[in-house]
Protein backbone atom coordinates (compact mmCIF):
# COMPACT_ATOMS: atom_id res chain seq x y z
CA UNK A 1 0.00 0.00 0.00
CA UNK A 2 1.54 3.20 -1.36
CA UNK A 3 0.09 5.90 1.22
CA UNK A 4 -0.83 9.70 -0.08
CA UNK A 5 1.06 12.13 2.89
CA UNK A 6 -1.47 14.79 3.44
CA UNK A 7 -0.72 18.10 4.62
CA UNK A 8 -2.20 19.25 8.01
CA UNK A 9 -3.84 22.98 7.27
CA UNK A 10 -5.96 22.08 9.83
CA UNK A 11 -4.34 21.93 13.36
CA UNK A 12 -2.99 25.35 14.29
CA UNK A 13 -3.00 23.69 18.00
CA UNK A 14 -1.40 20.71 17.24
CA UNK A 15 2.23 20.83 19.54
CA UNK A 16 5.25 18.67 18.87
CA UNK A 17 7.47 17.64 21.93
CA UNK A 18 11.01 15.87 20.47
CA UNK A 19 12.26 13.54 23.28
CA UNK A 20 15.88 13.04 22.35
CA UNK A 21 18.91 12.47 24.30
CA UNK A 22 21.73 15.49 24.18
CA UNK A 23 25.24 14.89 22.27
CA UNK A 24 28.49 15.93 22.52
CA UNK A 25 28.27 18.47 18.85
CA UNK A 26 31.60 16.41 17.59
CA UNK A 27 29.37 13.38 17.23
CA UNK A 28 26.36 12.18 15.47
CA UNK A 29 24.05 9.71 16.99
CA UNK A 30 20.94 8.09 15.19
CA UNK A 31 18.88 9.13 18.15
CA UNK A 32 19.36 13.05 17.39
CA UNK A 33 17.50 12.66 14.46
CA UNK A 34 14.11 13.95 14.10
CA UNK A 35 11.29 12.05 13.30
CA UNK A 36 9.17 12.73 10.73
CA UNK A 37 6.03 14.32 11.74
CA UNK A 38 3.04 12.48 12.19
CA UNK A 39 -0.48 13.71 9.73
CA UNK A 40 -3.38 12.20 10.91
CA UNK A 41 -6.91 12.96 9.21
CA UNK A 42 -10.31 11.32 10.10
CA UNK A 43 -12.40 9.90 7.62
CA UNK A 44 -15.65 10.80 8.04
CA UNK A 45 -15.30 10.00 11.65
CA UNK A 46 -15.58 6.10 9.82
CA UNK A 47 -11.70 5.51 10.71
CA UNK A 48 -8.53 7.50 10.56
CA UNK A 49 -5.19 7.53 8.88
CA UNK A 50 -1.85 8.52 11.01
CA UNK A 51 0.92 8.77 8.26
CA UNK A 52 4.46 9.59 8.44
CA UNK A 53 7.49 9.98 5.44
CA UNK A 54 9.18 7.16 6.10
CA UNK A 55 11.43 7.63 3.38
CA UNK A 56 12.67 10.40 5.63
CA UNK A 57 14.53 8.06 7.47
CA UNK A 58 18.28 7.55 6.34
CA UNK A 59 17.83 4.28 6.38
CA UNK A 60 14.71 1.93 5.82
CA UNK A 61 12.91 1.97 9.38
CA UNK A 62 9.68 0.59 10.72
CA UNK A 63 8.69 2.80 12.71
CA UNK A 64 6.30 2.44 15.81
CA UNK A 65 3.28 4.30 16.65
CA UNK A 66 1.81 4.12 20.04
CA UNK A 67 -1.27 6.65 21.05
CA UNK A 68 -3.78 8.00 23.62
CA UNK A 69 -6.28 10.42 24.75
CA UNK A 70 -5.16 12.96 27.43
CA UNK A 71 -6.79 13.89 30.76
CA UNK A 72 -9.74 11.25 30.17
CA UNK A 73 -10.74 7.76 30.31
CA UNK A 74 -8.81 6.34 27.61
CA UNK A 75 -5.50 7.67 28.59
CA UNK A 76 -4.38 4.41 28.18
CA UNK A 77 -1.00 3.67 26.25
CA UNK A 78 -2.71 1.92 23.49
CA UNK A 79 -0.44 0.20 20.38
CA UNK A 80 -1.34 0.56 16.78
CA UNK A 81 -3.21 -2.50 15.96
CA UNK A 82 -2.87 -1.76 11.83
CA UNK A 83 -0.39 -0.66 10.04
CA UNK A 84 -0.22 0.91 6.73
CA UNK A 85 3.10 0.45 4.79
CA UNK A 86 5.04 1.78 1.94
CA UNK A 87 7.10 -0.47 -0.21
CA UNK A 88 7.29 -2.68 2.75
CA UNK A 89 8.43 -0.33 5.95
CA UNK A 90 5.61 0.86 8.42
CA UNK A 91 4.59 4.68 7.08
CA UNK A 92 1.36 4.96 8.70
CA UNK A 93 -1.45 3.61 11.32
CA UNK A 94 -5.24 2.90 10.64
CA UNK A 95 -7.83 3.29 13.54
CA UNK A 96 -11.32 2.36 13.34
CA UNK A 97 -13.96 3.89 14.45
CA UNK A 98 -14.49 2.94 18.24
CA UNK A 99 -10.85 4.03 18.28
CA UNK A 100 -11.42 7.44 17.99
CA UNK A 101 -12.88 10.59 20.01
CA UNK A 102 -13.30 13.42 18.35
CA UNK A 103 -13.73 15.80 21.30
CA UNK A 104 -10.83 14.50 23.49
CA UNK A 105 -7.23 15.16 23.08
CA UNK A 106 -5.32 12.66 21.25
CA UNK A 107 -1.75 12.49 21.59
CA UNK A 108 0.33 9.90 18.83
CA UNK A 109 3.96 9.13 19.54
CA UNK A 110 6.18 7.67 16.98
CA UNK A 111 9.17 5.53 17.97
CA UNK A 112 12.55 3.58 16.66
CA UNK A 113 12.24 0.49 18.15
CA UNK A 114 15.76 0.12 17.37
CA UNK A 115 16.57 3.24 19.42
CA UNK A 116 13.62 3.35 21.88
CA UNK A 117 14.91 7.19 22.91
CA UNK A 118 14.71 8.40 19.45
CA UNK A 119 10.76 9.23 20.15
CA UNK A 120 8.35 12.34 19.25
CA UNK A 121 5.17 13.37 20.40
CA UNK A 122 2.07 15.09 18.96
CA UNK A 123 -1.19 16.40 20.55
CA UNK A 124 -3.75 16.64 17.95
CA UNK A 125 -7.60 17.61 17.83
CA UNK A 126 -9.11 15.39 16.40
CA UNK A 127 -12.61 17.55 15.36
CA UNK A 128 -9.91 19.82 13.04
CA UNK A 129 -9.25 17.07 11.18
CA UNK A 130 -12.41 15.57 9.81
CA UNK A 131 -12.54 15.09 5.77
CA UNK A 132 -16.14 14.25 4.81
CA UNK A 133 -16.79 11.82 2.07
CA UNK A 134 -18.06 13.75 -1.34
CA UNK A 135 -21.73 14.81 -1.28
CA UNK A 136 -23.58 12.26 -3.48
CA UNK A 137 -27.00 12.28 -4.94
CA UNK A 138 -27.11 15.49 -6.72
CA UNK A 139 -30.24 16.69 -7.85
CA UNK A 140 -32.11 19.69 -9.60
CA UNK A 141 -35.16 21.11 -9.53
CA UNK A 142 -36.73 23.62 -11.86
CA UNK A 143 -38.14 25.91 -9.06
CA UNK A 144 -39.62 28.82 -11.62
CA UNK A 145 -38.97 29.15 -15.50
CA UNK A 146 -35.54 30.87 -15.00
CA UNK A 147 -34.38 29.45 -11.25
CA UNK A 148 -33.14 25.91 -10.36
CA UNK A 149 -32.51 24.60 -6.79
CA UNK A 150 -29.51 22.09 -6.54
CA UNK A 151 -29.73 19.44 -3.72
CA UNK A 152 -27.21 16.82 -2.32
CA UNK A 153 -26.93 14.13 0.60
CA UNK A 154 -24.11 13.56 2.84
CA UNK A 155 -23.66 10.22 4.55
CA UNK A 156 -23.80 10.95 7.90
CA UNK A 157 -22.19 14.31 8.60
CA UNK A 158 -24.95 16.57 7.75
CA UNK A 159 -25.50 19.27 10.11
CA UNK A 160 -21.63 19.39 10.77
CA UNK A 161 -20.74 20.38 7.31
CA UNK A 162 -20.12 23.88 5.48
CA UNK A 163 -20.62 23.39 1.61
CA UNK A 164 -18.83 24.72 -1.42
CA UNK A 165 -20.54 24.73 -4.64
CA UNK A 166 -19.28 25.68 -8.03
CA UNK A 167 -21.14 25.97 -11.37
CA UNK A 168 -20.50 27.05 -15.01
CA UNK A 169 -22.33 26.63 -18.38
CA UNK A 170 -20.49 25.47 -21.14
CA UNK A 171 -19.97 28.96 -22.68
CA UNK A 172 -17.55 29.78 -19.29
CA UNK A 173 -14.02 29.73 -19.09
CA UNK A 174 -14.15 29.34 -15.08
CA UNK A 175 -16.31 28.03 -12.37
CA UNK A 176 -18.05 30.59 -9.96
CA UNK A 177 -18.40 29.62 -6.44
CA UNK A 178 -20.78 30.00 -3.68
CA UNK A 179 -20.41 28.69 0.00
CA UNK A 180 -23.54 27.12 1.44
CA UNK A 181 -24.09 26.67 5.08
CA UNK A 182 -25.17 23.27 7.09
CA UNK A 183 -28.53 23.08 4.72
CA UNK A 184 -27.20 21.05 1.51
CA UNK A 185 -29.10 22.76 -0.84
CA UNK A 186 -28.53 25.50 -3.55
CA UNK A 187 -30.63 28.06 -5.49
CA UNK A 188 -29.35 29.49 -8.85
CA UNK A 189 -31.62 32.56 -9.29
CA UNK A 190 -31.64 33.52 -13.30
CA UNK A 191 -30.90 30.82 -15.58
CA UNK A 192 -30.20 31.49 -19.40
CA UNK A 193 -31.94 29.19 -21.02
CA UNK A 194 -29.88 28.71 -23.99
CA UNK A 195 -26.85 27.74 -22.47
CA UNK A 196 -25.84 24.06 -20.31
CA UNK A 197 -24.67 24.37 -16.47
CA UNK A 198 -22.45 22.15 -14.53
CA UNK A 199 -22.76 21.67 -10.77
CA UNK A 200 -20.14 20.38 -8.22
CA UNK A 201 -20.11 20.60 -4.59
CA UNK A 202 -17.73 19.60 -2.00
CA UNK A 203 -18.13 19.81 1.86
CA UNK A 204 -16.36 20.45 4.74
CA UNK A 205 -16.32 19.46 9.02
CA UNK A 206 -16.59 23.47 9.93
CA UNK A 207 -17.58 25.27 11.45
CA UNK A 208 -20.35 24.01 14.02
CA UNK A 209 -18.86 20.71 14.60
CA UNK A 210 -15.21 21.14 14.99
CA UNK A 211 -13.11 23.85 12.91
CA UNK A 212 -10.91 21.35 9.74
CA UNK A 213 -9.65 23.08 7.22
CA UNK A 214 -9.48 20.09 4.55
CA UNK A 215 -12.47 19.77 1.75
CA UNK A 216 -13.58 16.57 0.85
CA UNK A 217 -13.36 15.50 -2.77
CA UNK A 218 -15.82 17.16 -4.98
CA UNK A 219 -18.96 15.66 -5.85
CA UNK A 220 -19.60 13.75 -9.31
CA UNK A 221 -20.66 16.67 -11.33
CA UNK A 222 -24.32 17.36 -12.56
CA UNK A 223 -25.53 18.61 -15.44
CA UNK A 224 -28.82 20.56 -17.13
CA UNK A 225 -29.34 21.82 -20.17
CA UNK A 226 -31.27 24.37 -22.76
CA UNK A 227 -32.50 21.42 -25.28
CA UNK A 228 -32.83 18.33 -23.21
CA UNK A 229 -36.04 17.97 -23.23
CA UNK A 230 -36.37 18.59 -27.02
CA UNK A 231 -33.15 16.36 -28.24
CA UNK A 232 -33.72 13.42 -26.08
CA UNK A 233 -35.48 13.88 -22.13
CA UNK A 234 -32.88 11.89 -20.91
CA UNK A 235 -29.60 13.89 -21.85
CA UNK A 236 -27.42 15.31 -19.31
CA UNK A 237 -27.22 12.79 -16.85
CA UNK A 238 -24.89 12.31 -13.55
CA UNK A 239 -22.04 10.21 -13.96
CA UNK A 240 -23.80 7.69 -11.70
CA UNK A 241 -26.45 6.98 -14.49
CA UNK A 242 -29.22 9.77 -13.26
CA UNK A 243 -30.84 10.90 -15.43
CA UNK A 244 -33.78 13.93 -16.54
CA UNK A 245 -37.07 12.72 -16.59
CA UNK A 246 -39.22 15.45 -18.59
CA UNK A 247 -41.52 18.02 -17.19
CA UNK A 248 -44.85 16.48 -18.40
CA UNK A 249 -43.80 13.83 -16.77
CA UNK A 250 -43.12 15.09 -13.24
CA UNK A 251 -46.18 17.94 -13.31
CA UNK A 252 -44.09 20.88 -14.33
CA UNK A 253 -40.94 19.71 -12.31
CA UNK A 254 -38.10 18.55 -13.96
CA UNK A 255 -36.02 16.00 -11.69
CA UNK A 256 -32.71 13.61 -12.01
CA UNK A 257 -34.05 10.14 -10.78
CA UNK A 258 -31.83 7.35 -10.28
CA UNK A 259 -31.99 4.26 -13.29
CA UNK A 260 -33.94 2.20 -10.94
CA UNK A 261 -36.61 4.84 -10.00
CA UNK A 262 -36.69 5.79 -13.94
CA UNK A 263 -37.82 1.76 -14.23
CA UNK A 264 -40.29 1.86 -11.81
CA UNK A 265 -41.38 5.08 -13.17
CA UNK A 266 -42.05 4.00 -16.86
CA UNK A 267 -44.09 0.81 -15.69
CA UNK A 268 -46.61 2.58 -12.83
CA UNK B 1 -2.78 43.71 -25.19
CA UNK B 2 -3.14 39.90 -23.50
CA UNK B 3 0.29 38.89 -22.42
CA UNK B 4 1.14 35.21 -20.34
CA UNK B 5 5.05 35.19 -20.19
CA UNK B 6 6.51 31.27 -18.68
CA UNK B 7 9.58 31.17 -16.88
CA UNK B 8 11.74 28.61 -15.45
CA UNK B 9 11.73 25.19 -16.94
CA UNK B 10 15.55 23.55 -18.02
CA UNK B 11 17.22 20.54 -18.03
CA UNK B 12 16.62 18.18 -14.85
CA UNK B 13 17.73 14.56 -13.75
CA UNK B 14 14.37 11.98 -13.50
CA UNK B 15 13.49 12.46 -9.75
CA UNK B 16 14.65 16.26 -10.20
CA UNK B 17 12.07 19.59 -9.16
CA UNK B 18 11.35 22.68 -10.76
CA UNK B 19 9.16 25.54 -10.49
CA UNK B 20 7.40 26.92 -13.59
CA UNK B 21 6.01 30.48 -13.27
CA UNK B 22 3.41 32.29 -15.53
CA UNK B 23 3.44 36.25 -15.27
CA UNK B 24 -0.20 37.30 -16.46
CA UNK B 25 -0.63 40.89 -17.84
CA UNK B 26 -3.80 42.41 -20.08
CA UNK B 27 -6.64 40.92 -18.35
CA UNK B 28 -7.82 40.99 -14.73
CA UNK B 29 -6.36 37.84 -13.77
CA UNK B 30 -8.37 37.31 -10.48
CA UNK B 31 -11.69 37.08 -12.87
CA UNK B 32 -9.90 33.77 -14.46
CA UNK B 33 -8.89 30.48 -13.03
CA UNK B 34 -5.89 29.47 -15.09
CA UNK B 35 -4.86 26.42 -16.09
CA UNK B 36 -1.26 24.46 -17.41
CA UNK B 37 -0.89 22.35 -20.56
CA UNK B 38 2.28 20.90 -21.90
CA UNK B 39 2.46 19.53 -25.42
CA UNK B 40 5.31 17.01 -25.70
CA UNK B 41 7.75 17.31 -28.47
CA UNK B 42 6.28 16.46 -32.11
CA UNK B 43 2.91 15.47 -29.78
CA UNK B 44 -0.39 16.82 -29.43
CA UNK B 45 -1.71 18.82 -26.24
CA UNK B 46 -2.32 17.89 -23.01
CA UNK B 47 -3.92 19.45 -19.65
CA UNK B 48 -2.12 18.91 -16.72
CA UNK B 49 -3.35 21.38 -14.22
CA UNK B 50 -6.13 23.85 -13.58
CA UNK B 51 -6.88 26.58 -10.05
CA UNK B 52 -9.90 28.18 -9.72
CA UNK B 53 -10.30 32.21 -9.18
CA UNK B 54 -8.98 32.22 -5.60
CA UNK B 55 -6.91 29.48 -5.50
CA UNK B 56 -9.10 27.86 -3.25
CA UNK B 57 -9.35 24.47 -5.07
CA UNK B 58 -7.39 22.89 -7.88
CA UNK B 59 -7.86 19.69 -10.27
CA UNK B 60 -4.86 17.39 -11.79
CA UNK B 61 -4.21 14.90 -14.85
CA UNK B 62 -3.83 11.27 -13.20
CA UNK B 63 -0.16 11.25 -14.21
CA UNK B 64 1.17 14.10 -12.16
CA UNK B 65 -1.39 13.90 -9.62
CA UNK B 66 1.12 13.76 -6.19
CA UNK B 67 3.83 15.08 -7.87
CA UNK B 68 2.86 18.50 -9.50
CA UNK B 69 1.16 21.29 -7.49
CA UNK B 70 -0.48 24.48 -8.83
CA UNK B 71 -0.69 27.47 -7.19
CA UNK B 72 -1.42 31.43 -7.75
CA UNK B 73 -0.43 34.69 -6.46
CA UNK B 74 -3.36 37.14 -7.21
CA UNK B 75 -1.69 40.26 -5.83
CA UNK B 76 1.22 39.34 -8.75
CA UNK B 77 -0.83 38.34 -11.91
CA UNK B 78 1.29 35.20 -11.33
CA UNK B 79 0.45 31.54 -11.45
CA UNK B 80 2.80 28.66 -10.70
CA UNK B 81 3.60 25.23 -10.84
CA UNK B 82 5.96 22.96 -8.68
CA UNK B 83 7.21 19.76 -10.30
CA UNK B 84 8.66 17.10 -8.67
CA UNK B 85 9.32 13.37 -8.84
CA UNK B 86 10.23 14.68 -12.54
CA UNK B 87 10.14 11.90 -14.83
CA UNK B 88 11.57 11.65 -18.61
CA UNK B 89 7.39 11.40 -20.13
CA UNK B 90 7.27 14.50 -18.40
CA UNK B 91 9.40 15.86 -21.24
CA UNK B 92 7.78 18.95 -22.71
CA UNK B 93 7.02 22.47 -23.20
CA UNK B 94 4.79 23.42 -20.97
CA UNK B 95 2.12 26.10 -21.86
CA UNK B 96 -0.44 28.28 -19.15
CA UNK B 97 -3.56 29.31 -20.15
CA UNK B 98 -6.32 31.57 -19.10
CA UNK B 99 -9.29 29.69 -17.97
CA UNK B 100 -10.06 26.45 -16.19
CA UNK B 101 -11.58 24.51 -18.92
CA UNK B 102 -11.61 26.98 -21.92
CA UNK B 103 -8.55 28.16 -22.66
CA UNK B 104 -9.10 31.94 -24.35
CA UNK B 105 -5.04 32.84 -24.15
CA UNK B 106 -1.76 31.02 -23.68
CA UNK B 107 1.77 31.76 -23.63
CA UNK B 108 4.44 30.86 -25.77
CA UNK B 109 5.84 27.98 -23.38
CA UNK B 110 8.67 27.04 -21.49
CA UNK B 111 10.61 23.84 -22.21
CA UNK B 112 11.14 21.14 -19.46
CA UNK B 113 13.56 18.57 -20.17
CA UNK B 114 13.85 15.61 -17.87
CA UNK B 115 17.38 13.38 -18.69
CA UNK B 116 19.80 11.83 -17.57
CA UNK C 1 -12.16 9.18 -19.05
CA UNK C 2 -13.91 10.95 -21.99
CA UNK C 3 -11.69 9.93 -25.30
CA UNK C 4 -11.77 12.37 -27.85
CA UNK C 5 -11.24 11.37 -31.86
CA UNK C 6 -10.51 13.80 -34.73
CA UNK C 7 -10.34 12.59 -38.31
CA UNK C 8 -8.69 12.99 -40.51
CA UNK C 9 -5.45 12.85 -38.85
CA UNK C 10 -4.09 14.96 -41.58
CA UNK C 11 -5.40 16.72 -44.84
CA UNK C 12 -4.06 18.38 -47.96
CA UNK C 13 -6.03 21.35 -49.69
CA UNK C 14 -5.93 24.60 -51.34
CA UNK C 15 -6.45 28.23 -50.73
CA UNK C 16 -10.30 28.27 -51.57
CA UNK C 17 -11.15 25.00 -50.32
CA UNK C 18 -13.95 24.47 -48.11
CA UNK C 19 -12.42 22.13 -45.42
CA UNK C 20 -14.22 20.23 -42.53
CA UNK C 21 -12.63 18.03 -39.69
CA UNK C 22 -14.57 16.00 -37.27
CA UNK C 23 -14.26 15.40 -34.02
CA UNK C 24 -16.00 12.81 -31.68
CA UNK C 25 -16.19 12.15 -28.55
CA UNK C 26 -16.46 9.08 -26.72
CA UNK C 27 -19.70 9.82 -24.83
CA UNK C 28 -22.28 12.74 -25.31
CA UNK C 29 -20.17 15.80 -24.07
CA UNK C 30 -23.59 17.72 -24.77
CA UNK C 31 -21.75 21.32 -26.28
CA UNK C 32 -19.05 21.18 -23.96
CA UNK C 33 -15.97 21.48 -26.85
CA UNK C 34 -13.81 23.94 -28.14
CA UNK C 35 -11.55 24.16 -30.92
CA UNK C 36 -8.00 25.29 -31.40
CA UNK C 37 -5.46 26.35 -34.26
CA UNK C 38 -1.99 26.17 -33.59
CA UNK C 39 0.91 27.10 -35.88
CA UNK C 40 4.42 25.24 -35.42
CA UNK C 41 6.36 27.30 -32.67
CA UNK C 42 2.92 28.93 -31.54
CA UNK C 43 0.66 29.25 -29.07
CA UNK C 44 -2.88 27.44 -29.86
CA UNK C 45 -5.50 30.06 -30.42
CA UNK C 46 -8.94 29.29 -29.25
CA UNK C 47 -11.35 29.25 -32.22
CA UNK C 48 -14.88 27.92 -31.39
CA UNK C 49 -16.00 27.78 -27.72
CA UNK C 50 -19.18 25.93 -26.78
CA UNK C 51 -19.76 23.71 -29.92
CA UNK C 52 -20.62 26.80 -32.26
CA UNK C 53 -19.71 30.14 -30.54
CA UNK C 54 -17.07 32.14 -32.61
CA UNK C 55 -14.24 33.52 -30.29
CA UNK C 56 -13.66 37.52 -30.49
CA UNK C 57 -11.67 38.28 -33.39
CA UNK C 58 -11.59 35.34 -35.12
CA UNK C 59 -12.79 35.10 -38.62
CA UNK C 60 -16.35 34.33 -39.85
CA UNK C 61 -14.67 31.77 -42.33
CA UNK C 62 -14.56 29.94 -39.00
CA UNK C 63 -17.98 28.01 -37.51
CA UNK C 64 -18.47 24.88 -35.85
CA UNK C 65 -21.59 22.98 -35.53
CA UNK C 66 -22.76 19.50 -33.62
CA UNK C 67 -23.99 18.25 -29.93
CA UNK C 68 -23.55 15.37 -28.20
CA UNK C 69 -20.91 12.91 -29.63
CA UNK C 70 -20.15 14.50 -33.30
CA UNK C 71 -19.08 17.65 -33.97
CA UNK C 72 -17.53 19.33 -36.74
CA UNK C 73 -15.30 22.81 -37.59
CA UNK C 74 -15.77 23.93 -40.91
CA UNK C 75 -13.51 26.33 -42.62
CA UNK C 76 -15.49 27.95 -45.22
CA UNK C 77 -13.08 29.30 -47.94
CA UNK C 78 -9.55 28.13 -46.76
CA UNK C 79 -6.90 31.28 -46.64
CA UNK C 80 -3.03 30.94 -46.32
CA UNK C 81 -2.58 31.26 -43.10
CA UNK C 82 -5.17 28.84 -41.92
CA UNK C 83 -3.05 25.74 -42.37
CA UNK C 84 -2.09 24.60 -39.29
CA UNK C 85 -2.84 21.99 -36.77
CA UNK C 86 -6.48 22.18 -35.08
CA UNK C 87 -7.49 20.84 -32.34
CA UNK C 88 -10.71 20.08 -30.48
CA UNK C 89 -11.26 19.85 -26.26
CA UNK C 90 -13.90 18.86 -24.08
CA UNK C 91 -14.54 19.94 -20.90
CA UNK C 92 -17.96 18.13 -20.00
CA UNK C 93 -16.55 15.96 -17.32
CA UNK C 94 -13.12 17.54 -16.18
CA UNK C 95 -11.30 16.44 -14.67
CA UNK C 96 -9.48 15.45 -16.79
CA UNK C 97 -10.04 17.80 -19.67
CA UNK C 98 -8.91 16.12 -22.59
CA UNK C 99 -8.27 16.88 -26.33
CA UNK C 100 -8.48 15.40 -30.04
CA UNK C 101 -5.38 13.95 -31.02
CA UNK C 102 -4.89 17.01 -33.69
CA UNK C 103 -5.49 17.43 -37.51
CA UNK C 104 -2.78 18.19 -39.81
CA UNK C 105 -4.00 20.62 -42.60
CA UNK C 106 -1.45 20.87 -44.81
CA UNK C 107 -1.45 22.92 -48.48
CA UNK C 108 -1.95 20.71 -51.19
Known amino acids: LNTTILTPNGNEDATTDFFLTSMPTDSLSVSTLPLPEVQCFVFNVEYMNCTWNSSSEPQPTNLTLHYWYKNSDNDKVQKCSHYLFSEEITSGCQLQKKEIHLYQTFVVQLQDPREPRRQATQMLKLQNLVIPWAPENLTLRKLSESQLELNWNNRFLNHCLEHLVQYRTDWDHSWTEQSVDYRHKFSLPSVDGQKRYTFRVRSRFNPLCGSAQHWSEWSHPIHWGSNSSKENPFLFALEAEQKLISEEDLGGEQKLISEEDLHHHHHH | EVQLVESGGGVVRPGGSLRLSCAAS????????MSWVRQAPGKGLEWISSINRNGGSADYADSVKGRFTISRDNAKNSLFLQMSSLRAEDTALYHC?????????WGQGTLVTVSS | DIQMTQSPSSLSASVGDRVTITCRASQSISSYLNWYQQKPGKAPKLLIYAASSLQSGVPSRFSGSGSGTDFTLTISSLQPEDFATYYC??????????FGQGTRLEIK
Open chain 2, 26 to 33: GFTFDDYG
Open chain 3, 89 to 98: QQSYSTPPIT
Open chain 2, 97 to 105: ASGEFRFDY
